[in-house]
């Protein structure tokens, strides 16, 4: 059974992941640049189901494409430093989903824009945090 301290750690990690994803989305929403149109043409795979921590495997598999898209946005008004950001997210995701379980991610048929992708994973974090508080 999960201990109080392990639940607290999970909640803190989820809060960090949530903030990181919100920070990316805020950066994109603030981004008034021709590159934004190009960013929105990139397609991301969405999970068929995302209700448990193991489903973060689906997010992990899309982190490299996410970094590539964010690299497009680099400018003096985009402060997210994609390599550091994705590295940080990756560490959190690995800790949250655990490395001992091998979960094969199932993706939905429809792909999504970066904004839809971020909103999906933000909602995932928010719903799990809500069950923990």
């Amino acid at each position: 059974a999960p201990t109080s301290s392990s639940t607290k750690k999970t909640q803190l990690q989820l809060e960090h992941l949530l903030l990181d994803l919100q920070m990316i989305l805020n950066g994109i929403n603030n981004y008034k640049n021709p590159k934004l149109t190009r960013m929105l043409t990139f397609k991301f795979y969405m999970p068929k189901k995302a209700t448990e921590l193991k489903h973060l495997q689906c997010l992990e598999e899309e982190l490299k494409p996410l970094e590539e898209v964010l690299n497009l946005a680099q400018s003096k008004n985009f402060h997210l430093r994609p390599r550091d950001l994705i590295s940080n997210i990756n560490v959190i995701v690995l800790e949250l989903k655990g490395s001992e379980t091998t979960f094969m991610c199932e993706y939905a048929d429809e792909t999504a824009t970066i904004v839809e992708f971020l909103n999906r994973w933000i909602t995932f974090c928010q719903s799990i945090i809500s069950t923990l508080t």
Epitope: E15, Q22, N26, R81
Partner: antibody, heavy 113, light 107 residues
Framework: QVQLVQSGAEVKKPGASVKVSCKAS????????IHWVRQAPGQGLEWMGI????????SYALKFQGRVTMTRDTSTSTVYMELSSLRSEDTAVYYC??????WGQGTLVTVSS | DIQMTQSPSSLSASVGDRVTITCRAS??????LAWYQQKPGKAPKLLIY???SLQSGVPSRFSGSGSGTDFTLTISSLQPEDFATYYC?????????FGQGTRLEIK
């Protein structure tokens, strides 16, 4: 216990820059992202932005983008907020907040010619 | 950006009164709402998080309710130390936004 201690009051001329510090103690520095919020005299609270203390990346409110820079020094567990091209409307108390539970005492920045 | 609208903007009440402050979001924020109390010259103090969870150390006379777009902060029996300004805040999405505040004064 958790403490966020901010630098002292500043008086600046229009067009100048100000750098406010926020020193954290009593917890693991990387555990709480730091928000900056300001409050003009007699007014409400206004979110300026956030910094991830582990990796140092930031996200700002659109209103402040291009004028604000948030940085951190992990060796001293200190976060900084620099606001440039100051104008009279920037006269306010500036707060840092860690995880919304713990707040600094506030730093009054007065912009006057 | 999500707009947070508080009402009333000011309120006069007496010690022992039951007081309710409302906060409305311009779009659904689920339960991602917090309430703060601020006294003159002091930093805001977190009272309620996740719309209805009482922050540790906050007296039980404070309670929060609501979800979606409509939220309330209730003080069941006003104490002298409760006269202050109260703010709601959404953290559902960035930019984080606050209500304009409700000033609670002694009648």
């Amino acid at each position: 216990q958790v403490q966020l201690v901010q630098s002292g009051a500043e008086v600046k001329k229009p067009g100048a820059s100000v750098k406010v510090s926020c020193k954290a103690s009593g917890y693991t520095f990387t555990n709480y992202y730091i928000h900056w919020v300001r409050q003009a005299p007699g007014q409400g609270l206004e979110w300026m932005g956030i910094i991830n203390p582990r990796a140092g990346y930031t996200s700002y409110a659109l209103k402040f983008q291009g004028r604000v820079t948030m940085t951190r020094d992990t060796s001293t567990s200190t976060v900084y907020m620099e606001l440039s091209s100051l104008r009279s409307e920037d006269t306010a108390v500036y707060y840092c907040a860690g995880g919304w539970l713990d707040w600094g005492q506030g730093t009054l920045v007065t912009v006057s010619s | 950006d999500i707009q947070m609208t508080q009402s009333p903007s000011s309120l006069s009440a007496s010690v022992g009164d039951r007081v309710t402050i409302t906060c409305r979001a311009s779009q659904s924020i689920s339960s991602w709402l917090a309430w703060y109390q601020q006294k003159p010259g002091k930093a805001p103090k977190l009272l309620i998080y996740a719309a209805s969870s009482l922050q540790s150390g906050v007296p039980s006379r404070f309670s929060g309710s609501g979800s979606g777009t409509d939220f309330t902060l209730t003080i069941s029996s006003l104490q002298p130390e409760d006269f202050a300004t109260y703010y709601c805040q959404q953290s559902f999405t960035m930019p984080i936004t606050f209500g304009q505040g409700t000033r609670l004064e002694i009648k």
